[in-house]
């Protein structure tokens, strides 16, 4: 997935974001989220 600085003139419309489950609980695995317009949604 491409990354762009927010002030570069590019807009990131959709980007898959991945979080580690163990960062928020005891489960293992990866949690997939989506960033739309700079906001992460489930």
């Amino acid at each position: 997935d491409a990354e762009f600085r927010h002030d570069s003139g590019y807009e990131v419309h959709h980007q898959k974001l991945v979080f580690f489950a163990e960062d928020v609980g005891s489960n293992k695995g990866a949690i997939i989220g989506l960033m739309v317009g700079g906001v992460v949604i489930a």
């Epitope: 974001l17 979080f19 580690f20 695995g29």
Partner: nanobody, 124 residues
């Protein structure tokens, strides 16, 4: 801030293997998620692999899944990237990065510490 020093890069032929290492100091290593990114000339920096604090969870970019393996040794504050079946398109500078837990591990801006990078060149 954690200090990161990569090693293990070099020149290898197509189909060969390399093992990159990244030694960390300055913060409690076991509290950090670790990732590897790469940047080829004229291209954006791109995520390759990440490993959780415990080492129990790993995640890979589709382009390296099944070829690259990330691992860590918390006792030695070191993270590794084993790269097999290398291709010329894997040629890039490879960077180790550290992130506090909770952020997106495939997003470079979530990482607050970066190494200086190590060059990997794959010849055909």
């Amino acid at each position: 801030e954690v200090q990161l020093v990569e090693s293990g890069g070099g020149l290898v032929q197509r189909g060969g293997s390399l093992r990159l290492s990244c030694a960390a100091s300055g913060r409690t290593f076991s509290n950090l998620n670790m990732g590897w990114f790469r940047q080829a000339p004229g291209k954006e920096r791109e995520f390759q692999a990440a490993i959780s604090r415990s080492g129990g969870t790993t995640y890979y970019a589709d382009s390296v899944k099944g070829r690259f393996t990330i691992s860590r040794d918390n006792a030695k504050s070191t993270v590794f990237l084993q790269m097999n079946s290398l291709k010329p398109e894997d040629t890039a500078v490879y960077y180790c990065a550290a992130a506090s837990p909770g952020g997106p591990i495939n997003y470079g801006r979530a990482y607050d510490s970066w190494g200086q990078g190590t060059q990997v060149t794959v010849s055909s």
